[in-house]
């Protein structure tokens, strides 16, 4: 039994780090493998993560952590019974993938303006709470070419756009994702999408 693709890990900078790897053949990850992780810190203990299958030869493990600070560094040991398959380390603050925003809502009752709001996925005491910026994706269900991205570079989790920038009388969907420049994070996953019917009064044309 050998590791084909070494574990790579990302942290949500809150309570979970996710490690993925591939074995050299079909593996029952949860029964055959264990990923041990230990904070490099005085009097810390090793903790065990039981991996799940992620495709035939792929495994994924969700490492539970109390919280994360920039100094944290973990040793990782991948075991198959008594055999050490791989040894590595992981610094969560250098591999951050933020949590996805939630509760995306489209408010259509503000004159001819669309107000999109969503929730910051972090509590106020988390460092990332005040460092997230967002990308909002809006697309038409009827026209695949009608696809746009709005970059929200301010901290407030909201976006206002004129309803008239979208076509009237058709359905649109929106989703939002986040990233944090301070830790050079990857983008989060997209939030679940929300749907609305776009309708607004066309201005009278004067001849």
């Amino acid at each position: 039994m050998k590791v084909l693709q070494e574990p790579t890990c990302v942290s949500d900078y809150m309570s979970i780090s996710t490690c993925e790897w591939k074995m050299n053949g079909p593996t029952n990850c949860s029964t055959e493998l264990r990923l041990l992780y230990q904070l490099v810190f005085l009097l810390s203990e090793a903790h065990t993560c039981i991996p799940e299958n992620n495709g035939g030869a792929g495994c994924v493990c969700h490492l539970l952590m109390d919280d994360v600070v920039s100094a944290d560094n973990y040793t990782l040991d991948l075991w198959a019974g008594q055999q050490l398959l791989w040894k590595g380390s992981f610094k969560p603050s250098e591999h951050v993938k933020p949590r996805a925003p939630g509760n995306l809502t489209v408010h259509t009752n503000v004159s001819d303006t669309l107000l999109l709001t969503w929730s910051n996925p972090y509590p106020p005491d988390n460092y990332l709470y005040n460092h997230l910026t967002y990308a909002v994706n809006i697309w038409s269900e009827n026209d695949p070419a009608d696809f746009r991205i709005y970059n929200v570079t301010y901290l407030e989790p909201s976006l206002r756009i004129a309803a008239s920038t979208l076509k009237s009388g058709i359905s649109y969907r929106a989703r939002v994702r986040a990233w944090a420049q301070c830790y050079n994070t990857t983008w989060s996953e997209w939030s679940p999408s929300t749907k609305w019917h776009n309708s607004y009064r066309e201005p009278f044309e004067q001849h």
């Epitope: 904070l39 810190f41 005085l42 009097l43 810390s44 203990e45 109390d66 600070v69 100094a71």
Partner: antibody, heavy 125, light 112 residues
Framework: EVQLVESGGGLEQPGGSLRLSCAGS????????MTWVRQAPGKGLEWVSS????????YYADSVKGRFTISRDNSKNTLYLQMNSLRAEDTAVYYC??????????????????WGQGTTVTVSS | DIVMTQSPLSLPVTPGEPASISCRSS???????????VDWYLQKSGQSPQLLIY???KRASGVPDRFSGSGSGTDFTLKISRVEAEDVGFYYC?????????FGQGTKLEIK
């Protein structure tokens, strides 16, 4: 009431051995790291050794490394310090102390918040 | 090893007056923001040491609020706002970020 009670001290000749014990009560003993600190007569405090809650991690002062062994029996809520090859400079009052909560991924530190009454070790011929 | 240096080593104080003890570490004991691994202990004559302050500025349970700790990185201070007769004894700072834990030499607080 959270309490630590040391025992096992006494008079021993240079080169001899002693085993100190520290019985814990009033807290979940296995969840906490434990530490030994000593104090030579008329001197300040000196850290001796520490052990994590499960016993998997141990640390020693250079002055005792290779001679002293820290261990614990969580089923008996007891901490030990096996002292071999004793020297005159090991003469001191030995205290055990409750250290950080070590079952969490990052050990949670609240200081050495409970200390035993101390047990006296005298090494003399 | 991290060396902890206390000053003064002797501190005569009039009851009701404030007192301050300094502790300097030879390297930073800051792990992350809010986590300075420095404690302060008081050892009264014939007794075991007792914890006063942990993580630089957190008062231990049951410790009177006249005791406070401050500082970050390498420089730390224990302050007693109004010294009482029962506060006499030896005060020690200690770092517990890395092994070996190291103590300051101790400061003897006595009543004038």
């Amino acid at each position: 009431e959270v309490q630590l009670v040391e025992s096992g001290g006494g008079l021993e000749q240079p080169g001899g051995s002693l085993r100190l014990s520290c019985a814990g009560s009033g807290f979940t003993f296995r969840d906490f790291a434990m530490t030994w600190v000593r104090q030579a007569p008329g001197k300040g405090l000196e850290w001796v050794s520490s052990i994590s809650g499960s016993g998997s991690s141990t640390y020693y002062a250079d002055s005792v490394k290779g001679r002293f062994t820290i261990s614990r029996d969580n089923s008996k809520n007891t901490l030990y310090l096996q002292m071999n090859s004793l020297r005159a400079e090991d003469t001191a009052v030995y205290y055990c102390a409750k250290d950080r909560l070590s079952v969490t991924v990052r050990p949670r530190y609240y200081g050495l918040d409970v200390w035993g009454q101390g047990t006296t070790v005298t090494v003399s011929s | 090893d991290i060396v902890m240096t206390q000053s003064p080593l002797s501190l005569p104080v009039t009851p009701g007056e404030p007192a301050s003890i300094s502790c300097r570490s030879s390297q930073s004991v800051l792990y992350s923001i809010g986590y300075n691994y420095v404690d302060w202990y008081l050892q009264k004559s014939g007794q075991s040491p007792q914890l006063l302050i942990y993580l630089g500025n957190k008062r231990a349970s049951g410790v009177p609020d006249r005791f406070s700790g401050s500082g970050s990185g390498t420089d730390f201070t224990l302050k007693i706002s109004r010294v009482e007769a029962e506060d006499v004894g030896f005060y020690y700072c200690m770092q517990s970020l890395t092994s070996p834990y190291t103590f300051g030499q101790g400061t003897k607080l006595e009543i004038k």
